[in-house]
């Protein structure tokens, strides 16, 4: 049994790090493999992750981690029974993929404005909470040529768009994703999209 592609891991910087790797041939990951991980820190304990299959030769493991902070470094050992297949390390703070924002809501009852709000995916005591900025993607299924990205670089998870900048009488969709500047993260996955109908009409000119 051999590792073809070594494990690579990303952390949500809250509670889960996901490691993926490829084996040299078809493998029943959960039956044949175990990924052991341990924080390099006093009084830490070794934890075991049971991997799942991810395609014929691919395996994925979701490592549960508590109180993830920048200095944390984990040792990783991939075992097949008594055979050590691979040994490595993982520093979560250097491989962060934030959680996707949630609860994206569109408020159209504000005069002349479309207000989009969403929730920060982290609790206030998480270190990413005050570091997230967002990208909001707005597009129209009725108008395939229309797709815009709005960068939200302030902390408040809201975006206001003048309704007059959108075509009247058609539907739009929006989704939002996040990244954390000071942690040099990748972008999160997109949130589920939400749909609304733009009924705004320009005031009739006299």
């Amino acid at each position: 049994m051999k590792v073809l592609q070594e494990p690579t891991c990303v952390s949500d910087y809250m509670s889960i790090s996901t490691c993926e790797w490829k084996m040299g041939g078809p493998t029943n990951c959960s039956a044949e493999l175990r990924l052991l991980y341990q924080l390099v820190f006093q009084s830490s304990e070794t934890h075991t992750c049971v991997p799942e299959n991810n395609g014929g030769v691919g395996c994925v493991c979701h490592l549960l981690m508590d109180d993830v902070v920048s200095m944390d470094n984990y040792t990783l050992d991939l075992w097949a029974g008594q055979q050590l297949l691979w040994k490595g390390s993982f520093k979560p703070s250097e491989h962060v993929k934030p959680r996707a924002p949630g609860n994206l809501t569109v408020h159209t009852n504000v005069s002349d404005t479309v207000l989009l709000t969403w929730s920060n995916p982290y609790p206030p005591d998480n270190y990413l909470y005050n570091d997230l900025t967002y990208a909001v993607n707005i597009w129209s299924e009725n108008d395939p040529a229309y797709s815009r990205i709005h960068n939200v670089t302030y902390l408040k998870p809201t975006l206001r768009i003048p309704a007059s900048t959108l075509k009247s009488g058609i539907s739009y969709r929006a989704r939002v994703r996040a990244w954390a500047q000071h942690y040099n993260t990748t972008w999160s996955e997109w949130s589920p999209s939400t749909k609304w109908y733009n009924s705004y009409r320009e005031p009739f000119e006299q």
């Epitope: 820190f41 006093q42 009084s43 304990e45 508590d66 109180d67 902070v69 200095m71 005591d125």
Partner: antibody, heavy 116, light 111 residues
Framework: QVQLVQSGAEVKKPGASVKVSCKAS????????MHWARQAPGQGLEWMGI????????SYAQKFQGRVTMTRDTSTSTVYMELSSLRSEDTAVYYC?????????WGKGTLVTVSS | QSVLTQPPSVSAAPGQKVTISCSGG????????VSWYQQLPGTAPKLLIY???KRPSGIPDRFSGSKSGTSATLAITGLQTGDEADYYC????????????FGTGTKLTVL
Amino acid sequence: QVQLVQSGAEVKKPGASVKVSCKASGYAFTSYYMHWARQAPGQGLEWMGIINPSGGSTSYAQKFQGRVTMTRDTSTSTVYMELSSLRSEDTAVYYCARGKWWWQYWGKGTLVTVSS
Amino acid sequence: QSVLTQPPSVSAAPGQKVTISCSGGSSNIGNSYVSWYQQLPGTAPKLLIYDNNKRPSGIPDRFSGSKSGTSATLAITGLQTGDEADYYCGTWDTSSPPQPIFGTGTKLTVL
């Protein structure tokens, strides 16, 4: 919200032992390490040791090795620090603090006075 | 146990800026992250800065931290009377066995 509530002040004789408690609430108790530190009157902070509430494993500062014992009770989300063979220089405020490499939440402190 | 060196006291007038230094060595500050704590009279320490320069939620941006080589600095701008307190730097000594160490503490007086 996160709270660390420590037991009340103690007065002990030299040679005795003291056991200070720190009850945690507002978070998942076993998910965060707990440190103990102390501060003698008018002095700075001194680290004593750490306990991992998940499995109960500990690590102590060399200065206190053999004299300090840290334990936890997951049923009550409480950690304990026991210091034995007390001497007058152990008179200090003892703090529990949550965290790993730095400590974001602290108890209010427990004053232990060692006096004959 | 090694201790980080801080000036015993600093002072400045309200509205002014003050800096507090923290000096260590290659086995501690030079090889680890620095945190800063504020201790108001009669209270427990409070985390002000972690990771050399990051602020926890709720700490105003008047407080900032930096690190260069084996020393670190806490800067406080727009001083307020409520900032009068003791300030401690902290880091990890990575010599065996690793352990947290603190600075000697600096008393800030707002004139």
